[in-house]
Every structure is written in C-alpha cells, then in structure tokens.
C-alpha cells in the first residue's frame, strides 16, 4: 500500500506510517511498527500530560512554593497541572501565578471598589463628594458623611474625602 502523507486525528506520521498518539496522562515509550501499536506508559506521581501526545517525558506538576506565598488551589492529576493560588492577603503577580504580592491598601481619601482575590489586586476609587475614608485599608469602602440634620444637629466642620463632617448643636440664640 501507498505510504500515507497525512494521518487522522490522534495519530502522527513516522517512518511512513500513521501511529496512534498517546492519550492524556501517558507518555510515548515506542512508536508503532508494522506489528505493534504505539506503546505508552502512564505519567508518574507528580507528573502530567494534558493532551494527546508523542512526548517521551511527562511534565512536572507546578510546585506551589509557600516561600513565595503560594498554596495549592487544585491538586494536579496525570492529565492536569497543579493550580496555585496565593495565601490570604496576597495575590498572584501574573496569570501563571508564579509568585504573590501583598494586597494593596487604599490610602485615606480612597475606598475599596473591589476587594482583592487570590488572583487580582485590590481596586481603589477616590471617595466622591459626600463620602470619606480616613484609614489605609484593603477592605474598607468610602463611608458616607454623617447626616447632621437627621440628628437635629448642624454641620460645624465640613467633611472632606479623608474626614467626616463634624456636627454640633443648633445655635439657640438665633431668632
């Protein structure tokens, strides 16, 4: 028969014949021959291959290094890599999550718009008029100024984006 020039899906061409690829979780030991199908072996402990392949070595699972603030989010299998995330209070520096940095805090005058996760940093926003934040925090939103009127008080000192208003008693000497 004519040797093939292209092979079906999940096959590869070698020595003018189509051999089956190894399934995910297995590595190639020997190419197929006229007498035998492709020989594959399962990946070892802490190794994986996530595609149909002809790799002779499995990939090592990612190591979630606690010294870099990493921990295991999802344990790897023979077909999937380990997924790392960051310890509480930290987030990944990249999509690959190879290291972590401390969540950023929002300075006074800024509040938390979105709390940080293991993979994204804190998002801060400036406190708009009528709101303030007087602390540096990774959790606190901008708080609304105190409403002096609802307490039957008057504004003695105007609020800023960093300070609340100061309320005081009404001036009773006024007509």
């Amino acid at each position: 028969p004519e040797p093939p020039t292209a092979c079906r899906e999940k096959q590869y061409l070698i020595n003018s014949q189509c051999c089956s690829l190894c399934q995910p979780g297995q590595k190639l030991v020997s190419d197929c021959t006229e007498f035998t199908e492709t020989e594959c072996l399962p990946c070892g402990e802490s190794e994986f291959l996530d595609t149909w392949n002809r790799e002779t070595h499995c990939h090592q699972h990612k190591y979630c290094d606690p010294n870099l603030g990493l921990r295991v989010q999802q344990k790897g299998t023979s077909e999937t890599d380990t997924i790392c995330t960051c310890e509480e209070g930290w987030h990944c520096t990249s999509e690959a999550c190879e290291s972590c940095v401390l969540h950023r805090s929002c300075s006074p005058g800024f509040g938390v718009k979105q709390i940080a996760t293991g993979v994204s940093d804190t998002i801060c926003e400036p406190c708009p008029v009528g709101f303030f934040s007087n602390v540096s925090s990774a959790f606190e939103k901008c708080h609304p100024w105190t409403s002096c009127e609802t307490k039957d008080l008057v504004v003695q000192q105007a609020g800023t984006n960093k300070t609340d208003v100061v309320c005081g008693p009404q001036d009773r000497l006024r007509a």
């Epitope: 030991v29 020997s30 197929c32």
Partner: antibody, heavy 113, light 108 residues
Framework: EVQLQQSGPELVKPGASVKIPCKAS????????MDWVKQSHGKSLEWIGD????????IYNQKFRGKATLTVDKSSSTAYMELRSLTSEDTAVYYC??????WGQGTLVTVSA | EIVLTQSPTTMAASPGEKITITCSAS???????LHWYQQKPGSSPKVLIY???NLASGVPVRFSGSGSGTSYSLTIGTMEAEDVATYYC?????????FGGGTKLEIK
C-alpha cells in the same frame, strides 16, 4: 541479514535464576524493540514483555512482572532476559524477537532438581 | 487483555485442498494489528501474514489473510505437504500482546 542468536539449553535448579542472552546483528540495534516470548512444551506462545534499547524502558505482561527482567547492552547489541525464583512452571523455550518480524532460535530452560 | 480463539485446534487436509483457519478476538483489534505465524516442530515461529492481509517476504502466494474488528482468517489456497505446521494468530494492538491457542495442520 537480520539475525538473533540465542544461547544453548540451560538446566537450572528450582529457586535459582537464569539470564538468557540474545545477540542481534544485521540491523541498528537501537532502532527496534526486542520482545520476549515463552512457549511451554506443546503449548501456545505467551508474550513476556519488550524493551526499547533506545531508552531502556521495558513493558511487561502483568503475568511475568517479578519473574522476568529485561535489559540491553547497547555496546554488544545484546538483549537479556533474567528469570528468577525458577519453578517447574518456568520450564519452556524462550524466544527473543525483533518486534515479532524476526525471531531467535529459542533457548530451552529446564528447571529440575 | 484481548483473548484470541482459534478454530479448529487441529485439522487434516489433503494436498491441493483449500484450508481456512479462523481467529476470533474478544475485543476489536485496532488498525488491523492481527498477524499470522507458522511454526514447524523444533523451529521458531515465522511470520506469514502481518496486519491482517500483508504477505511477509518470501511467503508463497497461496497464503492469504483477511478480516477486521474481531473476526480474522488465514487461508491456504492449495495445501502442500510442506504446510504441515502449527499456525498462530497474534494481536499487536494492545498490551499484553496475545496469541491464539494455535491450529495444528496435518496432511491426510
């Protein structure tokens, strides 16, 4: 011409081990796996396992795990099969074969006290 | 493992007769990795047919093979005295590779 030369008959005692050589010639030794096959007297053929001389990885028939060990010596183009803890059940002719296309002449192993 | 069942286990045929030996697999054999071997007394097995229907080098054209999936056969177009031997089918599709029990062919 492809040739697989096996050693002569072996008479071994129960519990002992035996190492059977298979010297290959007429082709590039590392290009093909070497298979090993057992044939008990008057019986069919049983595949023991194979070894890839390129990476030294062996694959075994589960039935022969712990019984057979396959190795190669690339420098002399020789494949070996060691059989251990021999019993009368291991009395048979053992063949090496280059991926089943070419076969050695067989080595008779007789286990007897 | 794939179990290969050959039939008949023994048979006698006259010279010139057409012979068919069958090999039935317990599960499908991928890419037709089914082969036939001839073994004469005191000799090692010799490939006759590989990959179901391909004639091995130096094998007389009176030998042929066919089949697919789980059902395969070896045919000798016209039996000759030198064909007296035991014939084995073998699969190279999945580990452990397995052989049929053999068919012993004798002459009448």
């Amino acid at each position: 011409e492809v040739q697989l030369q096996q050693s002569g008959p072996e008479l071994v005692k129960p519990g002992a081990s035996v190492k059977i050589p298979c010297k290959a010639s007429g082709y590039t030794f590392t290009d093909y796996n070497m298979d090993w096959v057992k044939q008990s007297h008057g019986k069919s053929l049983e595949w023991i396992g194979d070894i890839n001389p390129n990476n030294d990885i062996s694959i075994y028939n589960q039935k022969f795990r712990g019984k057979a060990t396959l190795t190669v010596d690339k420098s002399s183009s020789t494949a070996y099969m060691e059989l251990r803890s021999l019993t009368s059940e291991d009395t048979a002719v053992y063949y090496c074969a280059r991926r089943f296309a070419y076969w050695g002449q067989g080595t008779l192993v007789t286990v007897s006290a | 493992e794939i179990v290969l069942t050959q039939s008949p286990t023994t048979m006698a045929a006259s010279p010139g007769e057409k012979i068919t030996i069958t090999c039935s697999a317990s599960s499908s054999i991928s890419s037709n990795y089914l082969h036939w071997y001839q073994q004469k007394p005191g000799s090692s097995p010799k490939v006759l047919i590989y990959r179901t229907s391909n004639l091995a080098s130096g094998v007389p054209v009176r030998f042929s093979g066919s089949g697919s999936g789980t059902s395969y056969s070896l045919t000798i177009g016209t039996m000759e005295a030198e064909d007296v031997a035991t014939y084995y089918c073998q699969q190279g599709s999945s580990i452990p590779y397995t052989f049929g029990g053999g068919t012993k062919l004798e002459i009448k």
